[in-house]
Interface confidence: low
């Protein structure tokens, strides 16, 4: 006869690991006893059970409560064992040595892989602003054993660059993604991906990019002077930008005080009805806690009776 | 223009804690850190730490058990305590202003503080 | 921490000289390296940061290069009133400054 067992166990943190010992053998043979020994390289035998025909199973005291016989039906010629809630330092070298009749003792070694799923974490990197040069976006890590894979996925361009350290019994993977921020970047997802034996599916923690900016600011309203004429209701200037964090707008008049009358509202600038009071330098601030810029625009305000000759010159100009 | 200003007693006896104000005029210190870096007679500039306009500190870990910066906002005024010194201690102490990164755009010009009994 | 290694310690140069610098860091340190000059009972003026930026009213001499652990100062045409100590300094977590170059006249 001859002894069927596995080379390799693998079995995930906290589940219980089949240690497999199957005496195949010949019409009227018989298994007396199987005894089961751990047996790591340098480190001498240490007993686990003793599984006996006739008086059952005998469990060492280091692995009292720990390890068990397979639920019924049994076979007569089965010495597997059940080794309970299996921990990194279960991790080894196992023997199973069964006494036959009449054929004698035969014995059969295996390897019990414990595998330790990762717990990854995310860390952002620092505040990320639009004029950086390459920036740490976030780091990802993830310990377990075997080592994890930890990778990312995005539609960010950037470089990733990875280390790991290994511990007795496990290792830790850091991976860290670096990109040049820009505006473009902004609400994107980032996402670390970690892979691992231990792991039914892929592990992934997200972290959405926030990159600080702040768009040139212009001004829109003057772009057909002729409406700025005395009396004209409704005249508004309107400032352009864009920027995270959202940015706060403040106007001014460069050539003293606002006029009386004009309507701040955020990004607009609302006239009253025209007078040449109105006509000046009007700066849109624009701001937020990443920069500022500044525009300014120069509102002439026409007087149809002054102007219009200079109307007509204008219209037949462009 | 933003300038900084250290002041403080030049002298302190070993093992007292040596304190030292920077006082920040001309400019907003909102979005900005406050950093405190040393350099011993001769030698080379070491970095202490940072607070933000905020009240958040960062200290370089070598001297984080002996190194308090605080922040009075209302007077733009920010304090360096350094506690247990030696004469190992003796440099100029400069103020300086950065940005989130830490690189140092505008420095004080420097206190001695002599550490001797 | 990262430890920064600058060369060298001293050179002698002339007014007109092409004068290079260089600091290395322990690790990468990506584009995060500022240099700044230095002169007698003054405090550091920052010239150049974020690797090559150079700092508003820097003369255009001035320029800086690298990324990664190797770093290079250079100034194009030096004139006197560059002759001072030069220092880098890496802002990837706990800042450091080099040892320290000086610039010394011929």
């Known amino acids: 006869g001859e002894l069927e067992t596995s080379d390799v166990v693998t079995v995930v943190l906290g589940q219980d690991a089949k240690l497999p010992c199957f005496y195949r053998g010949d019409s009227g043979e018989q298994v007396g006893q199987v005894a089961w020994a751990r047996v790591d390289a340098g480190e001498g035998a240490q007993e686990l059970a003793l599984l006996h025909s006739k008086y059952g199973l005998h469990v060492s005291p280091a692995y009292e409560g720990r390890v068990e016989q397979p639920p019924p039906p049994r076979n007569p010629l089965d010495g597997s064992v059940l080794l309970r809630n299996a921990v990194q330092a279960d991790e080894g070298e196992y023997e199973c040595r069964v006494s036959t009749f009449p054929a004698g003792s035969f014995q059969a070694r295996l390897r019990l892989r414990v595998l330790v799923p990762p717990l990854p974490s995310l860390n952002p990197g620092p505040a990320l602003e639009e004029g950086q040069g390459l920036t740490l976006a976030a780091s990802c890590t993830a310990e377990g054993s075997p080592a994890p894979s930890v990778t990312w996925d995005t539609e960010v361009k950037g470089t990733t660059s990875s280390r790991s350290f290994k511990h007795s019994r496990s290792a830790a993977v850091t991976s860290e993604f670096h990109l040049v921020p820009s505006r473009s970047m902004n609400g994107q997802p980032l996402t670390c991906v970690v892979s691992h034996p231990g792991l039914l599916q892929d592990q992934r923690i997200t972290h959405i990019l926030h990159v600080s900016f702040l768009a040139e600011a212009s001004v829109r309203g003057l772009e057909d002077q002729n409406l700025w004429h005395i009396g004209r209701e409704g005249a508004m200037l309107k400032c352009l930008s864009e920027g995270q964090p959202p940015p706060s707008y403040n106007w001014t008049r460069l050539d003293g005080p606002l006029p009386s009358g004009v309507r701040v509202d955020g990004d607009t600038l609302g006239f009253p009805p025209l007078t040449t009071e109105h006509s000046g330098i009007y700066v849109c601030h624009v701001s937020n806690e990443f920069s500022s810029r500044d525009s300014q625009v120069t509102v002439d305000v026409l007087d149809p009776q002054e102007d219009s000759g200079k109307q007509v010159d204008l219209v037949s100009a462009s | 223009q933003v300038q900084l200003q250290e002041s403080g007693p030049g002298l302190v006896k070993p093992s007292e804690t040596l304190s030292l104000t920077c006082t920040v005029s001309?400019?907003?210190?909102?979005?900005?850190?406050v950093h405190w870096i040393r350099q011993p007679p001769g030698k080379g500039l070491e970095w202490l730490g940072v607070?933000?306009?905020?009240?958040?500190?960062d200290y370089n870990p070598s001297l984080k058990s002996r190194v308090t910066i605080s922040v009075d906002t209302s007077k733009n005024q920010f304090s360096l305590k350094l506690s247990s010194v030696t004469a190992a201690d003796t440099a100029v102490y400069y103020c300086?202003?950065?940005?989130?990164?830490?690189?140092?755009?505008?420095w004080g010009q420097g206190t001695l503080v002599t550490v001797s009994s | 921490d990262i430890q920064m290694t600058q060369s060298p310690s001293s050179l002698s140069a002339s007014v007109g000289d092409r004068v290079t610098i260089t600091c290395r860091a322990s690790?990468?340190?990506?584009?995060?390296l500022a240099w700044y000059q230095q002169k007698p009972g003054k405090a550091p003026k920052l010239l150049v940061y974020?690797?090559?930026n150079l700092q508003s009213g820097v003369p255009s001499r001035f320029s800086g290069s690298g990324s990664g652990t190797d770093f290079t100062l250079t100034i194009s045409s030096l004139q006197p009133e560059d002759f001072a100590t030069y220092y880098c300094?890496?802002?990837?977590?706990?800042?450091?400054f080099g040892g320290g170059t000086k610039v010394e006249i011929k």
């Open positions: 300086a202003r950065s940005g989130k990164w830490y690189y140092f755009d505008y």
């Open positions: 001309g400019g907003s210190i909102t979005n900005y850190g």
């Open positions: 607070i933000w306009s905020g009240g958040s500190t």
């Open positions: 690790q990468s340190i990506y584009s995060n």
């Open positions: 974020a690797a090559t």
């Open positions: 300094q890496h802002f990837w977590g706990t800042p450091t």
